[in-house]
Amino acid sequence: SIPWNLERITPPRYRADEYQPPDGGSLVEVYLLDTSIQSDHREIEGRVMVTDFENVPEEDGTRFHRQASKCDSHGTHLAGVVSGRDAGVAKGASMRSLRVLNCQGKGTVSGTLIGLEFIRKSQLVQPVGPLVVLLPLAGGYSRVLNAACQRLARAGVVLVTAAGNFRDDACLYSPASAPEVITVGATNAQDQPVTLGTLGTNFGRCVDLFAPGEDIIGASSDCSTCFVSQSGTSQAAAHVAGIAAMMLSAEPELTLAELRQRLIHFSAKDVINEAWFPEDQRVLTPNLVAALPPSTHGAGWQLFCRTVWSAHSGPTRMATAVARCAPDEELLSCSSFSRSGKRRGERMEAQGGKLVCRAHNAFGGEGVYAIARCCLLPQANCSVHTAPPAEASMGTRVHCHQQGHVLTGCSSHWEVEDLGTHKPPVLRPRGQPNQCVGHREASIHASCCHAPGLECKVKEHGIPAPQEQVTVACEEGWTLTGCSALPGTSHVLGAYAVDNTCVVRSRDVSTTGSTSEGAVTAVAICCRSRHLAQASQELQ
Amino acid sequence: QEDEDGDYEELVLALRSEEDGLAEAPEHGTTATFHRCAKDPWRLPGTYVVVLKEETHLSQSERTARRLQAQAARRGYLTKILHVFHGLLPGFLVKMSGDLLELALKLPHVDYIEEDSSVFAQ
């Protein structure tokens, strides 16, 4: 007797006949930038404060007839999804609504900017607890809207936005494309991406995760006790705003980076049928459906990591792609991927006092992606150790020579156009887990980190015959920080991390034919933090 | 709303000396850029967000906005400052002809200018 969407986001330990997780986000204030709302609806009465902020364009069409219930429809439903008494996610959260969309659901970038500024000023005048801002709207890519979101996020506000309903790359829309914003796509009761008429949910690397967004029952502005089903990425974003409110209420000190990592960590993994997405977007789109954590506390001991894909480099010979971690995250490894297989590897380099992951395209290549592994590692001191191409036939090696530093990732970068085509494979010496080994004509980069209680180990999985994909996963309690392919396999397209699994992709063997160096080995570096685990136990 | 033409006349007089000199000229080598929505039907030409460089103070934002109005008035264009931003981004929202973009991009402190565009409920 509970709506499917609430059941879906509820971990099994809360699942009785009713959705009743502990606490309801009562320490958190959620700002909603949307249409006007029916604040006296039973679902939200007394829990939504309508601010006096209004910045909306005129409705289109001379014959447009303003009908209050229609004007309030979108905002009322979303307020209900976030905090509604009966069909809401965070039943204890208080909300404030700002009107930035008119009765036709249309607004402007400028109106939204002024709304975000209003929130910032309110926060400065009267600082409260954690703030979540829900932006259930989308427009074309906007540098200024993304910049405003970045500033607000850096002021400690959690922004959650709709990925967009255009069945398109979310990176082409704002605020969905803003890296600091938590961008949410929509799935249905079958965990399929939501189709909306001829369009549907947006996808791609700018989406952080998905959430229920089809046939979502919520407050209807038609009457004070009415309910209605609505669909869209706005509804999905409202679920995540509610989950964020619950998490922040349980742990008010969580930073945006910590919250995002937890949202990803507690999501249902690999349940979405990726065939719905365009082929070139499948690898970039996170296969994650949001869920509440199984308990409100006790996640702090975990080493959280996420994968961040860069934009595509473009096909020019010297093109590069850069993937960056959030300010509070550590870049623990860097890998690259090219659909054509023509790439010149990747390297970690300092940029503005922070490490970034840069991938290099090769001559004749269609372009590359850089893939950063971004982790939460308090008190970490990480550095990159580089070995230039070696003359010796045994290949290039580099290790973490500083006391107490452990290897978290390996990258390799080469100047020659087609490394490995005419070269015999390099054998990696066993029993040396703290070093990276690469082709003799490649420079090798080791990510070496020191952090209290950090320990890492290397795990490999090799397949002698050519395979399109080789994977190796870290076991329970360990987190994947590094993912790379052993050198010498020329047909490798690249390596990337999916959740806790390292994936090495090779060329379609059926088209390339079996090569002499057919073996593909995926190398995962798995880490854990004993310090975080101990700190967590002490707290409990 | 006050009589705008009266305001312009006053502003032109007030800013003539400042404008004719090189006070607050754009820093050498930095060029402000113009951005607009890639989706044509969503564009809202005639309204622009002028974003100023990060450390610009509110007083400088207001001065830059007034300067734009004065320079536009000298060229016979009517402009209207709809909002001055501060708190998140320094800058201002202006209603003006697209003909003035080149002029606006050369104003001191300007980082970039973005044409307003539509957003939609999702």
């Epitope: 009713e18 959705y19 006296d40 008494r85 009966d86 009457c223 006790t225 009415c226 309910f227 | -």
Partner: antibody
Amino acid sequence: QLQLQESGPGLVKPSETLSLTCTVSGGSIVSSSYYWAWIRQPPGKGLEWIGSINYKGSTYYNPSLKSRVTISVDTSKNQFSLKLSSVTAADTAVYYCARENSGVVPAAGPNWFGPWGQGTLVTVSS
Amino acid sequence: EIVLTQSPATLSLSPGERATLSCRASQSVSSYLAWYQQKPGQAPRLLIYDASNRATGIPARFSGSGSGTDFTLTISSLEPEDFAVYYCQQRRNWFTFGGGTKVEIK
């Protein structure tokens, strides 16, 4: 079959607090599909909704009575209660309890009142 | 609040006749209107909900129509057990009831 039964004193003095309890049998009060309502009918007059509550204790009241009304729920006893403070002769009425479909679960039926209790007459008099 | 006005206050008819009861709202209630029947000493019983939908177990002789501000309950052919008081109720904005129409035997 779900049944509701009102109970409480039939006579209350002016300025005192009227207290009634509704006991639900034949079904559980614990369900997000329903709210539980109090409605009254002064002798020879029409019906007036007083307020409603769900099993989690979430209430909403008639704005005209809000300052005097408290509705509470006791899921362990499958009961919900009404308290109306500072009563006057104008509060003399037959008080009904009723189930109200919340509308959250469409399969539970339309968002209206039913079934109802038989009603209990409360007279306010000194 | 939304005020519902029922007319007539009393309707005197014979069994077999057609009864037409009216309910007018002070502002639009869309189709969020219900009709209840109440017999002496009994609790009200839901007949029609959302203006025109018959509740479970209600005979086909009862029908509802209207939307916005004007609504009608029609009993196509009165049966002896239909003589009672009928109330309309809206839920567009919280809950209010009409003053009732008494259908009595002529």
